[in-house]
């Protein structure tokens, strides 16, 4: 069979080969298609078929509007003036070419080192449905590859029978990477050979988390234990720039003291004894809590121990 | 909504002619393939003729070949009927529907408009 | 020219039975084929298109199968509302043809 692709709504002429260019003539058409169930043999003399293909006077058969229900094979059957018999198979595909594909939702910022969404590429109107690919920077995203993945959905209208295809990319931008990358979505069509159609392209910013070191706790004196009446110093050590700021919790509770990296429990009393924290909050990155410290009272001729008690008689201050 | 409005009924002599007119409304009429069809008193139905959306193609049953004419005018939504050589046997109420190809057969019909042949 | 033989040409019955019409082309006509609703002095009404498509507006109880070239309507559970007559139409082949019709009539 000869395959003819037609696009969907366009008119499509197929040749009856070896009919005699004007009647009388001895030909059948007959079609197995969306539209029958097995060989539909067309009446010459037209009838409510005509609609969706007719017999032209020269023996061709027309299609005013192909449909996707016109998919399938068309056979003609010919009888010269001598009585020579010719026949013609035809095999037709149909499609449609959607609209330029866009994307929909876009980032403008990405974070690297965790998954972002970067957006969602909507094709409307193909058929077959083809297909739709990410590209970074102008070369192809692999999915399930180095921090990308792709959610895809197709739906089909119910009544038009074309097709929506969406793809949401997902990506985890490497740390030190382009800080600019350009992403760009392509449907390619199912049929025919055709070239792909391309979005506009998006250059979402990526932000590098400025990385957290360790929010450090020191003691004075060390172990933390001292004998009541003494001093304890908690000095809370954030390197990050800008400094952020500290607040102080004892026993899981924030102190109700103004925000100081540096924590005071002077003349210290069994009321001072439990466990410390501080917490640095940084305006990009939330809070940060440091190791706990177990403050505890040692009486004379006991052993510091490693984690020590202070006793003291009020509050802390802060210096 | 869609609308068909069927006129130009009456009392006509055996030989005579009538011209029968039907208004269209509600939908894109020369999209839609369209057609008569009639029912003689207390009988069934029968299909009169069609044509297609153009206007360039016209069917009939042989009862009517060559006595009826299908027409339409797309730029005024109007279908029509010439019935030329009329008989008693055509008396009957004459509906006008929309469709008659295998996309659509017919969905919708207006109210009729009846047609007595009779001296 | 296809025959579509439909029977029976009437019927009596009680609102809520079940009731089926049958029509037999006489060739092969594929899906093409409607039914209609008639009521005295009005227009045919189109229940089923493309011998088993519901159409728009049409109540469920109404139904329409197709084996072969034998197409069914039937009424799930008649009302009040459906005594009338219903007719079959073939729409693949000139000359259209309709069935004879059947007429629904309360016992």
């Known amino acids: 069979a000869q395959n003819i692709t037609a696009r969907i709504g366009e008119p499509l002429v197929l040749k009856c080969k070896g009919a005699p260019k004007k009647p009388p003539q001895q030909l059948e058409w007959k079609l197995n298609t969306g539209r029958t169930e097995a060989w539909k043999v067309l009446s010459p003399q037209g009838g409510p078929w005509d609609s969706v293909a007719r017999v032209l006077p020269n023996g061709s058969l027309f299609l005013p509007a192909v449909g996707i229900q016109d998919e399938g094979i068309f056979r003609c059957q010919a009888m010269n003036r001598n009585g020579k018999e010719t026949k013609s198979n035809y095999r037709v595909r149909v499609y449609q070419i959607p609209g330029k594909p866009e994307i929909i939702d876009s980032a403008s910022e990405l974070t690297a080192g965790v998954p972002n969404k970067v957006g969602t590429c909507v094709s409307e109107g193909s058929y077959p449905a083809g297909t739709l690919s990410w590209h970074l920077d102008g070369k192809p995203l692999v999915p399930n590859e180095k921090g990308v993945s792709v959610k895809e959905e197709t739906r089909r209208h119910p009544e038009t029978g074309l097709f929506t295809l969406q793809s949401e990319l997902m990506v985890t931008p490497a740390r030190g990477g382009n800080p600019h990358p350009t992403f760009s979505c392509s449907f390619s069509p199912g049929l025919p050979r055709r070239r792909a159609l391309h979005t506009a392209p998006i250059q979402p910013r990526v932000w590098e988390p400025v990385p957290l070191e360790e929010v450090q706790l020191v003691v004075e004196p060390e172990g933390g234990a001292v004998a009541p009446g003494g001093t304890v110093t908690l000095t809370c050590e954030v390197p990050a720039q800008p400094s952020p700021q500290i607040h102080w919790m004892k026993d899981g509770v924030p102190l109700p003291l103004s925000p100081s990296p540096v924590l005071i429990l002077p003349e210290i009393g069994p009321q001072d004894q439990g466990t410390y924290r501080c917490v640095a909050t940084h305006p990009s990155h939330g809070p940060q809590e440091s190791r706990a410290v177990s403050i505890s009272i040692i009486e004379p001729g006991e052993e510091g121990p490693t984690a020590g008690s202070v006793g003291g008689s009020g509050p802390g201050t802060l210096a | 909504e869609v609308q068909l409005v069927e006129s130009g009924g009456g009392l006509v002599q055996p030989g005579g002619s009538l011209r029968l007119s039907c208004a269209a409304s509600?939908?894109?009429?020369?999209?839609?393939?369209m057609t008569w069809v009639r029912q003689a008193p207390g009988k069934g139905l029968e299909w009169v003729a069609s044509i297609d959306n153009s206007g360039d193609n016209t069917y009939y049953p042989d009862s009517v070949k060559d006595r009826f004419t299908i027409s339409r005018d797309n730029a005024k939504n109007s279908l029509y009927l010439q019935m030329n050589s009329l008989r008693a046997e055509d008396t009957a109420v004459y509906y006008c529907?929309?469709?008659?190809?295998?996309?659509?057969?017919?969905?919708?019909w207006g109210q009729g408009t009846l047609v007595t042949v009779s001296s | 020219d296809i025959q579509m033989t439909q029977s029976p040409s009437s019927l009596s019955a009680s609102v809520g039975d079940r009731v089926t019409i049958t029509c037999r082309a006489s060739q092969d006509v594929g899906i093409y084929v409607n039914w209609f609703q008639q009521k005295p002095g009005k227009a045919p009404r189109r229940l089923i298109y493309?011998?088993?498509n519901l159409a728009d507006g049409v109540p469920s109880r109404f139904s329409g199968s197709r084996s072969g070239t034998d197409f069914t309507l039937t009424i799930s559970s008649l009302q009040p509302e459906d005594f009338a007559t219903y007719y079959c139409l073939e729409f693949d082949e000139h000359p259209l043809t309709f069935g004879g019709g059947t007429k629904v009539e309360i016992k």
């Open positions: 493309r011998a088993t």
């Open positions: 529907a929309r469709g008659g190809d295998i996309t659509t057969g017919f969905d919708y």
């Open positions: 509600g939908f894109t009429f020369n999209n839609y393939w």
